[in-house]
Structure formats: structure tokens, C-alpha cells
Amino acid sequence: LVVTPPGPELVLNVSSTFVLTCSGSAPVVWERMSQEPPQEMAKAQDGTFSSVLTLTNLTGLDTGEYFCTHNDSRGLETDERKRLYIFVPDPTVGFLPNDAEELFIFLTEITEITIPCRVTDPQLVVTLHEKKGDVALPVPYDHQRGFSGIFEDRSYICKTTIGDREVDSDAYYVYRLQVSSINVSVNAVQTVVRQGENITLMCIVIGNEVVNFEWTYPRKESGRLVEPVTDFLLDMPYHIRSILHIPSAELEDSGTYTCNVTESVNDHQDEKAINITVVESGYVRLLGEVGTLQFAELHRSRTLQVVFEAYPPPTVLWFKDNRTLGDSSAGEIALSTRNVSETRYVSELTLVRVKVAEAGHYTMRAFHEDAEVQLSFQLQINVPVRVLELSESHPDSGEQTVRCRGRGMPQPNIIWSACRDLKRCPRELPPTLLGNSSEEESQLETNVTYWEEEQEFEVVSTLRLQHVDRPLSVRCTLRNAVGQDTQEVIVVPHSLPFK
């Protein structure tokens, strides 16, 4: 194809006449805005085809693209075409008129688009603005096409100055349909409800502007439809929520509730399910075992924990020896009940720096209008053993006695031992255990007393040694579950002048 003049861009005077010629080896035709304007077609003797387009009395509205293409009825495979762009600077025409569809630009992804505001004069300076603002946007301009770039979801206008007159274009609206892969989350105000209470579920989708929600639920299967409500969460762009509300639940409403979300732009979908349980009446159930005897160590802190599940939320009380406990101002007792999941609770009684007086019978009671449960245990305060006294004496009978007295809770065990070789024992040689055996020539007598007020045991043990022929280190060791204590005394023979 040969076009004269060749272009590709021409600037012509307003009111003038101009002739465009196109020739080729097959029939050719001029096109303007997808139409064929009146033109003269001819075939020369050499077989060359031509078309002459005469533009008369030019105005700014003649500005635009002109194409010459093969008009081939023989079906030759050719898509060759020549493009020419003509400007007719015309002060009476501001921006070239747009088709309505050019003013509305629709996108489903971030992509470059063109805002097609065009002028008749390639020398004019054109700027792009948001409709609401005066600041010119830094977007490149092509006089033949308009502004091209990545645009926000906004409305835009173009501005230019013709002579001393500022001219605005029509507004161009960019609509971006926000779509992304769908990720659904479903939650319920409560997953356990009593019959007669409400079931409320929410299904939320983020990052999509256009979605369809479909709920499946037990009632639907029996043909009893519930109309969900869809809303847009305020202050959260592209957060859409569907709410399914079932008033006055029945036992048959127990089961799986599924929210299925689809968007048709990219044909994405996702679904999530949640289980709802409708109970006839409320309940309180203990979880796990708590032994009927619990222990705490004197002056240490101890937390006693009870785990249970309940619906609706219960009231929790603790008692000691049938008296209600509360948080003490002195900080000696702390009570707390935590909701660790929708229906699971942990109730804790913390005794700070335990005292002997805190031993006793404890009860935790959890209750509401439908049910109650209670759990009781005895708290024993364990006291580490102390050896309070270790003394040696020489009765007239000739034997020698050693007396050991100590206290503790639980009941202490007593162990007697002796070292006969004071130089090597106990470092090199182990002490010898003493007890009720004839070869040791020792006898043991032990008495145990329980002191109610102090809530601990006292152990008094007397060791009788038949004859002592050389100095002897005698050791008394008291032991219980929370500790041990030892004292020793040197026992010397009667014959020696010193004790």
C-alpha cells in the first residue's frame, strides 16, 4: 500500500481542502471511525488500484485516524493497512467528542489504560486531573491517543488552554472491580445455644467487591428458608459479610452450617463450615479428675485448678470449711475463673505463701439456672521436717541414751546412724545405720504425736546404746515428703574423763 502524502502525522489548516491518495495491487479503501467516507476508487491500466479521499472545508472535528486497507473481495490473506493521523487545529473545538463508552473505563485487574482526551492541535499543553483536584497528575500524554498509565479507581478530567480560555474535557470514570482469590471465614456468636435462643453466624470475605453468598444449614434441608443479610463492613475496604440469623433455635437446628462464596469475574469460589449444637437445657460438666486429697507446702504459693465446661456461662464460688472465699485484700488468696474457649473454663484458687491455718476442706461450686456441679478436696499443708532437739545422757544403768525430737507434715521418718572412726567417717567410710538389732547393741524407741492446732506430727525417738568403748558420732536424720534435717552428737565412753 502506498499513501500520499505519507504522513504518518499531518497538520492541516482549518477550512482548507486536502486530498489523500492510497494505491495498491488490490482494491483499496479509506476508513474513518470504522466507516467508509465518500471516496473515488479507480483501477489504472497497469492493474494498480487507487482510492482518493478529498477532505473539504476542514474543521477540528476532522482530527483523527485515517486508515487505508485492502478492500479484497477475492479473500486474499492480508491484514496490511496504513494509518495516517491528521490534526486540524481549530480554536472553536476544545476536546474532541467521545463516544459514551469511552467515558466509562472498566477494569478487573491492575493494567495500563488510556484516558482518551484528544485535542485538535498537537502544540497544545494538556494536563490530567482528578475531577475533585487541581493538581496535574504526572502521566505521559500522547496527542493522538490521550493519557496512558495505571489509574486509580477515580474520576478524571483533562484540561488545556486555547488562547486565553481554559477548557475542560468530559469526566472519565475508571471503575475497578476488586477481585482476588476468595478466602472465606465463618464464625458464630455462639456455637452452643439452648433451644429458644438465637443462632447468628457471619461469613466474611476480604479483597473482593462482587461476591455471591450461599448458605447451607439444617433448616434449609427441611425447606424452611432463612433470608441472610449482606453488608459491607465500615472502614474496611472490600470486606463483605453475610449474616445468617435463626431466631428461637430448635434441637433440629443442630448440625453443619456452610457458607459458600463465589465470584463470577474470575470464577473463584471457597466455602467454610461450622458446627452448631442446640441443647435442650444448659449444662455444667467437670473435665478431668481432681484428687480428694491435695497438698501445699508451708510458706510456698500453691494454685489449685479445676477445669470444667458449661453453657451458659456459670457463676463460680469457692468455699473453705463451708465458708465462702473471696479475693483477700492482703493478697493471701486469689480467685480467678478464665474462659479458655467458648464453653470451657478454668477456675483457680491461689494461696500465696501458704499458712498452716489454710489446711482444711475446700469446695468449688459452678452453677447457673439449669445445672450445677461441685468438687471438694482436703488440703493438707506439708511442713518440712526440723530436728528440734538432739541430746545425749548417761542413766545410772550404765547404758547411754541419745534422744532426738523433730516435727513435720506429713509424718517424718527417723533414721539413726553412727560413725565409729571419727577420722575417716563419714567422708571415707559410710555411717552405720543403727536400729533394733542385738549385734548393734542398740535399742530404739519412737513415739509419734499429732498436734491438731499446728497440724503437724512430732516424733520423739530414743536410742539406747549398751556399751560405748570409744567416741562415737551419732546422727539423727528426719525425713518427709518435703525435706530432711540432720543433727549429730558425739557420744564418749563412761571411762573417758570428758564428754
Partner: nanobody, 116 residues
Framework: QVQLVQSGAEVKKPGASVKVSCKAS????????MSWVRQAPGQGLEWMGW????????NYAQKFQERVTITRDMSTSTAYMELSSLRSEDTAVYYC?????????WGQGTLVTVSS
């Protein structure tokens, strides 16, 4: 918050007409025009037409000029799009959309299926 809620899915026979509604809430209906757009399976978005909210003026895409009518009812803040002489190629999801100047808002879409 601006919200556009469209009518439900429709199944129509070729040659019939369909009328889709779009109810607006959360803004002054008169302040924004309403566009109608469609998306056929596997295709991009296609603008059909627009109605001015204040005076009811309409603009239609050339392709739909003869077959589409867009109207609005100010009292209920609802816009309507009617497409006549339906053919199988009109099977698509139809959206209403409005522009608030600083962002656009869309209806959830209405699937129209044309099948004999």
C-alpha cells in the same frame, strides 16, 4: 457505606426480555449516575449504558442501542436495566456500578441465562 443490591438470577428463552433491578443505599442516589456492565463467560467487562441520577438522561453503547433500556425510580433509589430480544450470547453476569468520584461501587451481579 455505599451498597448496591441486585435482583436474583434469571433464566429466559431466546426472544424474551429481562429486567434487572439495582437498589442503592448508603449515599444520596441523586448524586451519582448508574452504569450497567456485563461479563459473558470467559470474556471481559462490557459497558452497556448509563443513566444520570439527577435528570434521568441515558447513554447507551452502540452495540446495545436498539435493545437496552435503563430507567430509575428516585422514590426507591432503584435503577433498572431491561434487555430485549434476548439471544444465547446474552448469557452473562450483569452488574450495576456507580462512581463516588474517589472509588467505584458495584452490585453483586445477576446471572442471566438465555436457553431454549
Amino acid at each position: 457505606q455505599v451498597q448496591l443490591v441486585q435482583s436474583g438470577a434469571e433464566v429466559k428463552k431466546p426472544g424474551a426480555s429481562v429486567k434487572v433491578s439495582c437498589k442503592a443505599s448508603g449515599y444520596t442516589f441523586i448524586s451519582h449516575g448508574m452504569s450497567w456492565v456485563r461479563q459473558a463467560p470467559g470474556q471481559g467487562l462490557e459497558w452497556m449504558g448509563w443513566i444520570s441520577a439527577d435528570n434521568g438522561n441515558t447513554n447507551y453503547a452502540q452495540k446495545f442501542q436498539e435493545r437496552v433500556t435503563i430507567t430509575r425510580d428516585m422514590s426507591t433509589s432503584t435503577a433498572y436495566m431491561e434487555l430485549s430480544s434476548l439471544r444465547s450470547e446474552d448469557t452473562a453476569v450483569y452488574y450495576c456500578a456507580t462512581h463516588g468520584g474517589d472509588r467505584s461501587y458495584w452490585g453483586q451481579g445477576t446471572l442471566v441465562t438465555v436457553s431454549s
